[in-house]
């Protein structure tokens, strides 16, 4: 039975040219996290595997940095980065948990970052 829940940074906004941390947190389960996949709509961005470490898709290497933790840092943001991002937690024995984050990249220099929880 899957008892866990994923907390995410929810809907966030950031300034064009800036950077943002995408963060998810799996709670309420003792399941072992074996791998976390990060996807942007229809693109695999990165994978963090408990044994193999990080794999960043080559096409995103210049703008995506691993961490902090199981999170992902997007750099040099463009308006085209606006959209949905998903963290997919592969766990044992529970199975798969998915969290959703919506990022809006703003032209304006006024970009609020409304996180649901504090990023360590």
């Amino acid at each position: 039975m899957m008892t866990g829940t994923i907390e995410t940074t929810g809907n966030i906004s950031a300034e064009k040219g800036g950077s943002i941390i995408l963060q998810c947190h799996l709670s309420s389960t003792t399941a072992q996290v074996t791998q976390v996949n990060w996807e942007q709509q229809d693109q695999l961005l990165a994978i963090c595997n408990a044994d193999l470490g990080w794999h960043i898709s080559p096409s995103f290497k210049d703008r995506v940095a691993p961490g902090p933790g199981l999170g992902l840092t997007l750099q040099s943001l463009t308006v085209n980065d606006t959209g949905e991002y998903f963290c997919i937690y592969h766990t044992y024995p529970d199975g798969t948990y998915t969290g959703r984050i919506f990022l809006e990249v703003l032209e304006s220099s006024v970009a609020e970052h409304g996180a649901r929880f504090q990023i360590p």
Partner: antibody, heavy 118, light 107 residues
Framework: EVQLLESGGGLVQPGGSLRLSCAAS????????MNWVRQAPGKGLEWVAS????????YYADSVKGRFTISRDNSKNTLYLQMNSLRAEDTAVYYC???????????WGQGTLVTVSS | DIQMTQSPSSLSASVGDRVTITCRAS??????LNWYQQKPGKAPKLLIY???SLQSGVPSRFSGSGSGTDFTLTISSLQPEDFATYYC?????????FGGGTKVEIK
């Protein structure tokens, strides 16, 4: 250098059993998911089974479910495929393949031929 | 199950030609799409993973593109050693499935 070496193939009668082995070397075996893929003579590739690197999660094609069992012995760096109740349609070259991140298969063995015939 | 449909099933081309092979998934698979090359009597070889990432050691004339349901493998300038059969494969969900293959033959 990554190497995967399959063995255990051969001729078996319908209803019989075989156990295939895949000896791995050149990498940290227990960090990788592993797969069995087969290819019937003159046909395309067909995935048979996968085992995840850490948890031992196992997945099977419907065509072999209940008859084949995938397993691994990380202390021996070896992947296995126990094949029971074999049928003529199981005749194929069986490949083992390494599956980093359970997303792609980057190294393949040379294959071992299984022939099911009376 | 996710069905993978490859086209064409075979093609004839000359050395130096630009060759394009397409693969369509029966549902969205994000970019969980890999391409393999297989020569007669040999094991498959990974060319492209995650739709567009070139596997180490594979010549840059090979490229992959697409996401969602439609994917393409392109060989920019066909070389003699490229005559082989090419397969796409989805790893979005089990059962993992392969396309039927595209045989690239010498014209």
């Amino acid at each position: 250098e990554v190497q995967l070496l399959e063995s255990g193939g051969g001729l078996v009668q319908p209803g019989g059993s075989l156990r295939l082995s895949c000896a791995a070397s050149g990498f940290t075996f227990d960090s990788y998911g592993m797969n069995w893929v087969r290819q019937a003579p003159g046909k395309g590739l067909e995935w048979v089974a996968s085992i995840k690197y850490s948890s031992g999660y196992k997945y099977y094609a419907d065509s072999v479910k209940g008859r084949f069992t995938i397993s691994r012995d990380n202390s021996k760096n070896t992947l296995y495929l126990q094949m029971n109740s074999l049928r003529a349609e199981d005749t194929a070259v069986y490949y083992c393949a390494r599956g980093p991140y359970d997303v792609w298969m980057d190294y393949w063995g040379q294959g071992t031929l299984v022939t099911v015939s009376s | 199950d996710i069905q993978m449909t490859q086209s064409p099933s075979s093609l004839s081309a000359s050395v130096g030609d630009r060759v394009t092979i397409t693969c369509r998934a029966s549902q969205s698979i994000s970019s969980y799409l890999n391409w393999y090359q297989q020569k007669p009597g040999k094991a498959p070889k990974l060319l492209i993973y995650a739709a567009s990432s070139l596997q180490s050691g594979v010549p840059s004339r090979f490229s992959g593109s697409g996401s969602g349901t439609d994917f393409t493998l392109t060989i920019s300038s066909l070389q003699p050693e490229d005559f082989a059969t090419y397969y796409c494969q989805q790893s979005y969900s089990t059962p993992l499935t392969f396309g039927g293959g595209t045989k690239v033959e010498i014209k």
